[in-house]
Interface confidence: medium
């Protein structure tokens, strides 16, 4: 874990002069109102900044926009508003940036009332040029790119039409009417729900789920009595109304909706909801809301088919009203997730899992922190993390937890140390081992970002007063240096760095404010001269992830395998560089019973790793059905945890039981499916 700050803080020499030479100010002369920023492509250095200003007139609001472009990571900007004919761009649609490095951008313009359709501006050369296109409809949503082909766009119209373009927005065709929700699936497939009797709201629970695999030439109805649907990993989920009452259930398909299985999850009533918290090609985390306005529910984790679910975490905080949950995927270490639970006493506590939801535990108390007033025992308490819920409650939390896949093991978050989350002003904590151990990194709330794959962490104090100081660390948050980036303080509005944490540039956005003038300003700081040399082999050290007991042969085994990483030494001040690739060495572990989950009809008694047959199937277990057809369930009671790669060791093969429990999903019996062509 990261040791606390000590006397031997490695200071970066002459950093003020080095950073001053690499600090670029840009004042946006005619700028106010709101500003939005988008990166176009990866490693291109192209940033688009769209500013909008609403002019209040007596009867209506008239808006104006400016569009700026940088191609050097924000050091310089050029006003390119003339490329969009000085048109007002609708910020609620944002800037639709194409997938991967397609260089495509779509801006949706405001058009005067009474026009036949909307207007878009399209670029396919990283915003060097734009083409104006008048639409045959008024868009309701932002243009959605097909993940497989950035020339294919879809959009919903204000009249609930589903429109598709095959030539990057040049020509549009309405492929279906009465559409509520549409999403791209894999292989340029479109899934969408339709209503029959008037509106999406009126028909909720009676919608039909459709699929087109050829951009609207032909269609297939793949679901009826639909409430909503969602895609996660390779799974297609639909919540379907029950025949007999107002409850609904989750059905899952892994073949794009051709066949469905009822998920072994509780049904929910009108006031409840399901939510896919996270999904990959192996499994899914599903939240099922409790009855009543409790603000919590239960997390279930699926098997590899998305059908059998294990209860993962009770009393999981997920507010019904605002739809806030603290569920966070820690992307810097495999299998790690953090979330909050609502205790019996209504306090909120943070829980962490290191094995993809198998077991949850409290976060270890940071060595360099004392327990706060929420702690009954001043020597025993935990770290509690502030995330979306705290932000929604307007606590002094400027940022959600941060982790990056290429900054292995690093997690940064606001938190408090006690028995539960505190409403007091939080501090910033860091973990360098994926959440096993934590250290207080900065006093008070801050904005923070990771640069150069973890080689630099940058932070700015969250303050209502103007600021002119940035903090940075080259040793994963142990030691901090401060740099005054401007003489005249600015009202800070945000930190911007290129997604992916590979960049060495950070942009500080804000505005200068005097009684008569308000101007946006950005300062872009390039840290390349701080990290003077490229990292070499000697700068890296071997680190075993998930290591808790080095004496144990199985130490580091999570989901059947362990991984050793090459990690940058904290004392090394060097550039990982833009082309840095995480180096890891996996090794397979022997299987134990913990590598298996209990299959349908089986459960694990308290403190036992064996799966035992349920004496009788009750409630939703009884209704559970496989593949949407009547069939006998045969199982040996165990199923390998999704993504688990263990080999050898314990092999829980035993007599295959025929549970002889008939269960039916008449949601989609084959006779209910039909096809049609345009």
């Amino acid at each position: 874990s990261a040791p606390g700050e000590d006397e031997e803080c490695g200071r970066v020499r002459d950093f003020v002069a080095k950073l001053a030479n690499n600090t670029h100010q840009h004042v946006f002369d005619d700028l106010a109102g709101s500003v939005s920023l988008s990166w176009v492509g990866d490693s291109t250095g192209v940033i688009l900044v769209l500013t909008t200003f609403h002019v209040p007139l007596v009867i209506m609001t008239f808006g104006q926009s400016k569009l700026y472009r940088s191609e050097d990571y924000g050091k310089n900007f050029k006003d390119i508003t003339d490329l969009i004919n000085n048109t007002f761009i609708r910020t609620e649609f944002g800037m639709a940036i194409g997938p991967e490095n397609s260089g495509k951008v779509v801006l949706t313009a405001e058009v005067s009332g009474g026009s036949r359709g909307g207007r878009i501006f399209r670029s396919s050369d990283f915003a060097k040029n734009f083409v104006q296109t008048d639409l045959p409809f008024h868009p309701l949503t932002q243009m959605m790119y097909s993940p497989q082909n950035s020339d294919y766009l879809l959009a919903l119209s204000t009249e609930n039409g589903l429109w598709v373009s095959k030539n990057f927005g040049g020509k549009w065709e309405e492929i279906h009417k009465a559409v509520c929700l549409a999403k791209w699936g894999s292989d340029n497939t479109i899934f969408f729900t339709t209503y029959a009797n008037g509106s999406c709201k009126a028909d909720l629970g009676a919608l039909e789920l459709w699929r087109t695999s050829d951009l609207g030439k032909s269609f297939k109805t793949i679901g009826v009595k639909i409430y909503s649907f969602g895609l996660g990993g390779r799974f297609l989920f639909a919540s379907v109304m029950a025949d007999k009452d107002t409850t609904r259930r989750i059905h899952v398909s892994t073949d794009q909706g051709d066949t469905w299985s009822m998920a072994q999850l509780p049904s929910v009533g009108q006031e409840q909801f399901y939510s896919i918290l996270a999904a990959n090609d192996d499994m899914v985390f599903m939240h099922v809301d409790e009855p009543g306005d409790t603000g919590f529910g239960t997390i279930f984790t699926s098997d590899d088919r998305g059908i059998v679910y294990s209860k993962s975490l009770d009393r999981h905080l997920y507010t019904t009203t605002g739809g806030e949950t603290d569920f966070t995927n820690v992307t810097s270490l495999r299998g790690v997730y953090i979330t909050s639970v609502l205790s019996e006493d209504n306090s909120i506590q943070t829980m962490i899992t290191f094995d993809q939801g198998g077991r949850w535990t409290h976060l270890r108390k940071p060595e360099n922190s004392e327990c706060d007033a929420t702690a009954k025992n001043k020597n025993e308490c935990s770290l509690h993390i502030h995330a979306s819920y705290s932000i929604s409650q307007k606590l002094n939390v400027p940022m959600a937890p941060l982790s990056e896949p290429n900054a292995v093991g690093i997690v940064i978050a606001h938190g408090s140390v006690g028995d539960a989350i505190s409403v007091m002003v939080p501090d910033v904590y860091i973990s360098d081992d994926g959440g096993y151990s934590w250290t207080k990194m900065l006093e008070g709330p801050h904005y923070y970002t990771i640069l150069d794959s973890g080689g630099i962490i940058v932070a700015i104090e969250h303050s209502s007063r103007p600021i002119n100081v940035i903090k940075f660390s080259t040793d994963e948050g142990q030691c901090w240096q401060t740099y005054t980036f401007t003489r005249d303080p600015i009202y800070f509005t945000g930190l911007a760095s290129e997604p992916g944490a590979r960049s060495m540039n950070i942009s500080i956005w804000g505005f200068t404010e005097s009684f008569l003038t308000s101007q946006w300003v950005s300062y872009t700081i390039d840290f390349k001269d701080i990290l003077e040399r490229n990292c070499e082999e000697k700068d890296y050290t071997i680190w075993l992830a998930h290591s808790t007991d080095p004496e144990d042969y199985e130490d580091g085994c999570i989901l059947g395998y362990k991984e050793q990483f090459l990690r940058l030494r904290k004392s090394s001040v060097c550039q990982n560089g833009r082309d840095y690739v995480v180096t890891k060495q996996p090794s397979i572990c022997l299987c134990s019973l913990e590598d298996f989950l209990c299959d349908f009809g089986y459960y694990r008694p308290e403190n036992d790793s064996k799966c035992v047959e349920q004496p009788e199937l009750k409630g939703h277990d009884l209704e559970f059905c496989l593949y949407g057809r009547e069939e006998h369930l045969t199982t040996n009671g165990y199923r390998k945890i999704p993504g688990d790669k263990c080999q050898g060791g314990v092999n829980p093969v035993r007599e295959v039981k025929d549970l002889k429990k008939k269960c039916t999903s008449n949601f989609l019996s084959p006779e209910k499916q039909n096809s049609k062509s345009n």
């Epitope: 200003f53 002019v55 209040p56 009202y491 009684f515 008569l516 308000s518 101007q519």
Partner: antibody, heavy 124, light 106 residues
Framework: QVQLVQSGAEVKKPGSSVKVSCKAS????????ISWVRQAPGQGLEWMGG????????NYAQKFQGRVTITADESTSTAYMELSSLRSEDTAVYYC?????????????????WGQGTTVTVSS | DIQMTQSPSTLSASVGDRVTITCRAS??????LAWYQQKPGKAPKLLIY???SLESGVPSRFSGSGSGTEFTLTISSLQPDDFATYYC????????FGGGTKVEIK
Amino acid sequence: QVQLVQSGAEVKKPGSSVKVSCKASGGTFRNYAISWVRQAPGQGLEWMGGIIPIGGWANYAQKFQGRVTITADESTSTAYMELSSLRSEDTAVYYCARQGRKTGYYYYYGMDVWGQGTTVTVSS
Amino acid sequence: DIQMTQSPSTLSASVGDRVTITCRASQSISSWLAWYQQKPGKAPKLLIYKASSLESGVPSRFSGSGSGTEFTLTISSLQPDDFATYYCQQADGHITFGGGTKVEIK
């Protein structure tokens, strides 16, 4: 249509303080500045200072520095001007006005909406 | 602070006359100048902002010009309703008003 409604006339003794309020209705309060301008009998207009309600950012004319305090309450869309250590020369009509600012492409720079004025008389 | 000098302080004119009022700033204020009209017992009314932009609802006989340090308010054809006091106001840094020009009936 935005309106600024000021508090009623005041009669004050020399050395005391006066606090005049200015309530905005019918439009956005926060995006503009509010200026305070006074006019002594038979004299011209004199700017005292102003505030940006969005951040409570106040600015004062040199002449009134230390003697005037301008505040704003966003929740009630009300601005206040307090003048202390009153003397007979402070007898005047005090106006609040919505002040356009150099923000954005709409350089709305004048004081386009005015309150009805509050007469403050300082007399022993 | 920037000083604003308005001239003349009083101006006698008749209905239909073309009237010009000038305002001089002690240093350059770019175009950050506004003109107001005030009648006795009433609050001032904005006529021109940003030196030459006409406030909505103001008759087109009013116009403003100038930049830097020299500014002019022109009433192309004086109407009975135009007899009032006119003030210029700069807005570059702290705000200051000119001393006023009273337009009275000749």
